[in-house]
Every structure is written in C-alpha cells, then in structure tokens.
Interface confidence: medium
C-alpha cells in the first residue's frame, strides 16, 4: 500500500479518462467487473478507506499485459489499460459497521487490437480520491494493488476471482470477448454474416477466409482440456503455452519435445517445427522481438506499446505510470513520457515491485523491513541510524554517572565506576557484602577494592572458609570475659606477637594482591567501603568513600548505615586473610589501590587495635 506521502506524486492528468488513440477496429475487448472492495476478513482490517472521516470515493484502474510475468520490468500495459469512473461519494459513519464500499458503475473495458494471447497478466489498482478541503484539489492515494497471471480463452464465460491486498479484499469477474467479425478463442478468425460479401473488408486483419456460419458454435476435440486448450477449427485441440499433449493435459516441462516452434501435433503432442515467430521482426518502431512458446513478445522503446509496438504517442494524459509513479513528459503531446517511480517500484511504467530488502540495505546485520513508505532497519545492539550505519559510540552523552569512566566496544557500553559506585551506569551505591560472602559467622566489611572478612574465632581465610585447626582444637586462648555477644572477639596480644601476626597477615595480603593483579587487571574498580556483617548489618566506624554512617559510641561497628544494593557486583574482590586474633577496626585509607588505577608508590596503612600494631606497607 502506498502511504499518504505518495498521494502528492500522482499527477492530475492521470485521473483523466484513459485516451485510446484512433486505431482500427479492435479484435476484442477484455471486460472487468468489480463486485466489491472492502475490508478483508480477520483482525486488523481497516474500517474505512476514508481517512479522518473526510468524504472520499473510489476508482479503479486495470493494466493488461500478455505473457507469463506480471512483474516484467520493461513490459508496459501492452494489451491495454483502462480507468473506471468515480464511485459514489462515501463518508464514514462513526460506530457503523464497515460496509462494502460504493463502487463505480459499469465495466472496465480494455480493447485489444491483435490476437488475445490466452495467457495474460493483470494489475488492478484501487485508488481513493479524498474530497476534503485540500489546497489544489482532491488528493489521490493508492489503497490497494493486486496482480496476477491467468489463462483465459476469449469467448468463454465470466471468471470470478478474489484477491487480497494487505487488509483489503477485492472481488471481481473478468472475461475476454471478440468484437465482430472476429471469432475464436484468440479472436483471430474472421467471419461475416450470411448476407455479407465474401471478401475482406477494409481494416480486417489478417485477411483470412471469411466463414458464412459465424453463429455456429465452435466445438473443440472431445476431451480437450478446457483450462489449457482451445480451438479455432472444429475438432481441434491447440494448447496454451506451458501445456502440450493431444488434449493439452501434459505440462511442457514433462514433455520430450525439443522444438519450441510451431503448432501442437495432434498425434504426438509435440511442437512441430515451423517458421520462427520473430522471423522478419514483427515489432515496429524499433521494438525488439523475443520468442515465447506459442508466439512472440515485443519489448517496445519508450513511447510505444501494443503487441507489436505499433501504438505510439503515449503521453502523461494516458496515465501510463502505475503505483503512484510521477509522469513527466515534454510539452509536445506526442513526446515520450518518463515515469519517476516511487520507492519500491521500477520499470518503464513503475509496474514492477522491487524487493528492496533483497539488496540487504541494512548495514551491520540490521533487519530490513519494507514499510512501503520507507525502508526501516532494525539495528543490532551497538549500531544505529536509519541504515544501522553508525557504530555506536557507547560512551556518547556521558553514559556513566558519578564520575565513572566509559569503556567502548562490543555494542554495549561498560562503565569503570568511581570508588563507591557500581551498576551498569555507576548510578548505584555498591555493596559487595550484600551476598554475605563471609562464612562461619564472619563479618563482612566492604572496602574500596572489594571486601574484608573479619572471621569468627577458629576460622580464617579470605571468606573465613578455613578452620584454623581442622581437627577443631583451637590453638588460641579463649575469649576474655566481658565481651558482648556479636562483638568481634579481640585478643589482647603482646605487642611483639601482635606485630608478628599483623606482618603475616599483611604479607599474605600482598601476595594475594599480586596474584589478583596479574589475573584480573581488567576489574572495574567499583567496589567500595561498606559493611554487611552476617547476620546483622554493620559498617566500619568511619564514613568512608561517600557512605554515610553514624558513629557508634563504642569501639564496635556502628549499626546505622546508608547504602544501596548493587546491580552487579563481582564477589571476587581483594581479600585480607584475617586471623581470629585481629579485628580490622579501621581502614583509614584504601588497603590497596583499585586495580584499574594501580597507583604506584602510595603508602597504605593497616590500622589495628593498638598503636604499636600499625604497619606501613609499601
């Protein structure tokens, strides 16, 4: 369906009744009767062709072409075209059921001058004329277009058809009839009334012998296929193209016949060699001839049409451009026209629909959708633009909040967050302790670079996962009296022993950091100081890295904390292997710099309960 944008393209001259140039008497007339046009069955069907409740009316146009391909690029309406009258004015009634729309009166008639080809292609267009207050007169737009290929013998009964175009449905009948004195299924035989002189009258072509009994019914050979055969002499069975056999019941593709020329033999069903239909070039006005199984086809130069390119002087007044094409021609009425085709159509008359998506116009793996109005590309992640031509700068527009650094690539931006923030866009306060990583009752303290577990007595390890003595016997003294439940258990160690243990812990931590740095140099430094001990929530006593905490009155951790859970926190941080005798009460500066910054030479301190336990680690 052509969008409203195309309505402006339709030249007003197209709406003039089709002008057939003076010519000799036609061999016959193709007649089209439109029965109904309206919404098709099923959901999503349009209520009305009239937009915005403006009055509108319908008209139809038909294009006929010989041969098998209704989509042939350089094949104009060689058999002819016709335009209907306007239908009655219709105004949509709000709330009323969708009616069958009022149609133009009468038939669409397409005279043809030469033999009826038997196989033909058609295009039927339904146009809407809006009768609102448009500047410059009515607006036209193409509502529906149906096309098909049919086999039809002249002189036969009406054939009925139903075609759907989008949500619309068109019901119609058609037939081909010969105009006297032509008779036969191809309108090639001439006859005269009984009283007529037995000579060829002027303009009767070809000048074949006239027969007296024009009214006698023509009886084909018994059993001759009514769909694929026809006859011009009684008892004959001639096959339409694509079929062969004595009764025209065998598709050509299964036949062993070799020659494409000549009439069908009644005995073998094979095509008997004969003179070529293009011999002597029957195409006039510079047309080029190509053979078809039964006849020939002329490809006409612009400005000519007809079976033999004999009809000249087509102008824009004849409305030769289909599918909303814009007709451009010189001031001279006899000058050739050019059709500027809307997107999606091509050919000298814009009669060929183009599968624009077959050209794979969407770049970078985008999905192509042909909307008629435009092509739309649905882009893969990481690409944008009408043709997905832009490789997204994922970091455009400062996608990372709170001072985070955006890392491009892969179609999905990645943020390396500033200290204290996490999540995809660094908009969330991160809490690496949320997952309760410390085992066996250990308390979790979030740190700039990860988390620290303060283990309960008898456990050690980054996550307090290792018992100090696997056999269960503790090598350390029992907890001194006077400690409240839930307090971290501290042990009053001699300063020398405290230093020794602290040095061991620091050494282990350094070793762990070295390993971690080598293996995970790409970690985003988005972990922050925050604590989620288990099972209750605690924080380190100092407000670190933008986390608001309320200082507790005692030495233990404060119980009031303000932070948010992270969207996506890597649980593998940098961990201090803690011994039960050490309670990491404060971390005044980062234990280690965030991995992605790697600030060399910074002095970092571990603070322990006693001033004598302060270590300086380079």
């Amino acid at each position: 369906m052509v969008s409203p944008r195309m309505s402006g393209l339709l030249s007003q001259t197209v709406i003039l009744a089709l002008i057939f140039l003076p010519q000799t008497r036609p061999a016959g007339v193709f007649e089209l009767q439109i029965h109904s046009f309206g919404p098709g069955p099923g959901p999503g069907a349009p209520r009305s062709p009239c937009s915005a409740r403006l009055p509108c009316r319908l008209f139809f146009r038909v294009c006929l072409k010989p041969g098998l391909s209704e989509e042939a690029a350089e094949s104009p309406c060689a058999l002819g075209a016709a335009l209907s009258a306007r239908g009655p004015v219709y105004t949509e009634q709000p709330g009323a059921p969708a009616p069958d729309l009022p149609l133009p009166d009468g038939l669409l008639q397409v005279p043809f001058r030469d033999a009826w080809p038997g196989t033909f292609s058609f295009i039927i267009e339904t146009w809407r004329e809006e009768l609102g207050d448009q500047i410059g007169g009515p607006a036209w737009s193409l509502l529906a277009r149906v096309a098909g290929r049919r086999r039809l013998a002249a002189g036969g009964p009406w054939a009925r058809d139903i075609q759907r175009a989008g949500a619309w449905e068109l019901r119609f009948s058609y037939r081909a009839r010969c105009e006297p004195p032509a008779v036969g299924t191809a309108c090639t035989r001439l006859c005269r009334p009984r009283s007529a002189p037995s000579r060829c009258g002027p303009g009767l072509r070809p000048c074949a012998p006239l027969e007296d009994e024009c009214e006698a019914p023509l009886v084909c050979r018994a059993g001759c296929s009514p769909e694929h055969g026809f006859c011009e002499q009684p008892g004959e069975c001639r096959c339409l193209e694509g079929w062969t056999g004595p009764l025209c019941t065998v598709p050509v593709s299964t036949s062993s016949c070799l020659s494409p020329r000549g009439p069908s033999s009644a005995t073998t069903g094979c095509l008997v060699p004969g003179p070529g239909p293009c011999d002597g070039n029957p195409c006039a006005n510079g047309g080029s001839c190509s053979e078809t199984p039964r006849s020939f086809e002329c490809t006409c130069p612009r400005g000519f049409y007809g079976l033999r390119c004999e009809v000249s002087g087509v102008t824009c007044a004849d409305g030769p451009c289909f599918n909303g094409g814009l007709c451009v021609g010189g001031a001279d009425p006899d000058s050739a026209y050019i059709c500027h085709c809307p997107p999606g159509f091509q050919g000298s008359n814009c009669e060929k629909r183009v599968d624009r998506c077959s050209l794979q116009p969407c770049r970078n793996g985008g999905l192509c959708l042909d909307l008629g109005h435009a092509l739309r590309c649905r882009c893969r992640a990481g690409f944008a633009g009408p043709r997905c031509e832009h490789d997204l700068d994922d970091c455009a527009g400062r996608a990372c909040a709170n001072g985070g650094t955006c890392v491009e690539g892969g179609g999905a931006h990645r943020c390396s967050c500033a200290l204290g923030f996490g999540g995809r866009d660094c908009r969330e306060r991160a809490d690496p302790c949320a997952a309760r990583p410390c085992a066996h009752g250990g308390r979790c303290y979030a740190h700039f670079s990860g988390l620290v577990c303060a283990c309960a007595p008898g456990y050690m390890g980054a996550r307090c996962e290792f018992p100090v003595h696997p056999d269960g016997a503790s090598a350390l003294p029992a907890a001194p009296p006077g400690l409240r439940p839930g307090d971290p258990q501290r042990y009053l160690l001699p300063p020398a022993l405290g230093l020794l243990v602290a040095a061991g812990v620091a050494g282990a931590a350094l070793l762990l950091v070295h390993v971690r740095r080598r293996g995970h140099s790409q970690d985003a430094g988005s972990r922050l100081l925050a604590g989620t001990p288990e099972p209750s929530v605690h924080a380190l006593p100092d407000a670190l890295n933008n986390l608001r905490t309320q200082e507790g009155s005692g030495d233990g951790p404060s119980s009031s904390v303000d932070w948010n859970r992270p969207e996506d926190v890597d649980p593998q941080g940098i961990y201090v292997i803690s011994a039960p005798s050490i309670y990491a009460r404060e971390v005044a500066t980062p234990l280690f710099p965030p991995l992605h910054t790697g600030r060399a030479g910074q002095r970092q301190h571990l603070l322990f309960p006693y001033p004598s336990s302060i270590l300086s680690v380079k």
Partner: antibody
C-alpha cells in the same frame, strides 16, 4: 560530516521579497529531499516546503500558509537549497531553518538541521 | 492537516529526575514520528525517529514509545544539558506538522 548552513536573512519591508540559501556539504545532495522550516520568535516550528530528490524529479510540496508566495528550489551543481519569498508579511518574521529529509527510501527525515537565519519583516 | 497536540507546554524538574513528554496525533500516523531537541542557542537536533528509535550519538537516557496515537519521550535521569525545548514531528503525510513544544526548565 553533514553540514547545512543557511544565509540570506535580514530586514525586509512588508510586501518585499527575499531569497534564503542553504549550503549543504558532507553528503550526496541530489540523493535527498530537503525542507525549509521556520520558527517565529517564541513560537513553535512550522514546516514550509519540501523539494524531492533526483530520483523523484525534484518535485515540490508546500504548506498552505505559504503556497503561492514561497518557492523552494535547488542548485544541485552547487549543493544549495533556496527559498524565494515574495509578498512578505510581518507574520513571516522568524528564524528559517533548512533540514535534510528522506532519501526516498530510509528514514533520514529531519536528521540534520542548519543553524538558522533570521528574517525580520517590518516597516 | 494532522494536528500534533503536545503536553505539557512547560515542565520544571530537577537534575536526576525522570520526566516524560507526550504528543497526540489527530489522525493515524503509524510510527512516523520524530522527537527534536532545540537548545537555547537555536540549535536543533533529532533525538528519536520512528517513534522509538534512538539516533546515534544520543544518550541512552532518552527513549521514545508509542501507544496508538499517543507518543512519549522520556528522559530517565535529567542532566544539565537536557534543559531545552522539545518538539514532536509527524512525517506520515504532508504537510509535516510539529507539536507546540515543551519547555523543560531546571527547578
């Protein structure tokens, strides 16, 4: 880089005429439809006119408010879009923008705009 | 002509806040709608086309959606450079028509 640069604005008396230009660069000018849009001071944008691309015969469309007085045209050899304005009125005072439109296939509608040129119609 | 009714005409909001602007089409326009941003210096930039497709180079905090004839532009977390005028534009049929605009101001 796609670039659109308008020029030609100024002070004109009512009833006078003026031609605005829009120099285009960074894309194949003949492949694209082009538009003129205006914005009176403190008011909304208003589409004025369109000229189609080579494939569609450089045909035109106008807003009813300017049809007959304004003419859109293009010089494809120089990559310049024009708006010829006649019988100017006080209500034509506005900033005038040119904008790139579709190429007839893809949805490039109004994807690039010029910086605007100002027309004042006053006696 | 297709009328585009845009609301609100002005809006005050704070940094980090989420805001939504709406446009309603008087006729069916499918998703042939764009959202444009106009800075105080007059510079105009297309943010979204086809109702919901983000233009390249536009921050992901901008998003567009369609429900029937109603169209929305949302900004998930306002930043200082987002304070500007915003217009919707239908390009389904001629004449192209714009909404009346929304002035987004800092609170």
């Amino acid at each position: 880089e796609v670039k659109l640069v308008e020029s030609g604005g100024g002070l004109v008396q009512p009833g006078g005429s003026l031609s605005l230009s829009c120099a285009a660069s960074g894309f194949t000018f003949t492949d694209y439809y082009m538009n003129w849009v205006r914005q009176p001071p403190g008011k909304a944008l208003e589409w004025l006119a369109l000229i189609r691309n080579k494939a569609n015969g450089y045909t035109t469309e106008y807003n009813a408010s300017v049809k007959g007085r304004f003419t859109i045209s293009r010089d494809n050899s120089q990559n310049i879009l024009y708006l010829q304005m006649n019988a100017l009125r006080a209500e034509d005072s506005a900033t005038y923008y040119c904008a790139r439109d579709s190429d007839g296939y893809y949805e490039y509608y109004f994807d690039y705009w010029g910086q605007g040129t100002t027309l004042t119609v006053s006696s | 002509d297709i009328q585009m009714t845009q609301s609100p005409s002005s809006l005050s909001a704070s940094l980090g806040e989420r805001v939504s602007l709406t446009c309603r089409a008087s006729q069916e326009i499918s998703d042939y709608l764009s959202w444009l941003q106009q800075k105080p210096d007059g510079t105009i930039k297309r943010l979204i086309f086809a109702a919901s497709t983000l233009d390249s180079g536009v921050p992901k905090r901008f998003s567009g959606s369609r429900s029937g004839s109603d169209f929305s532009l949302s900004i998930s977390s306002l930043e200082s450079e987002d304070f500007a005028d915003y217009y919707c534009l239908q390009y389904a049929s001629y004449p192209y028509t714009f909404g009346s605009g929304t002035k987004l101001e800092i609170k």
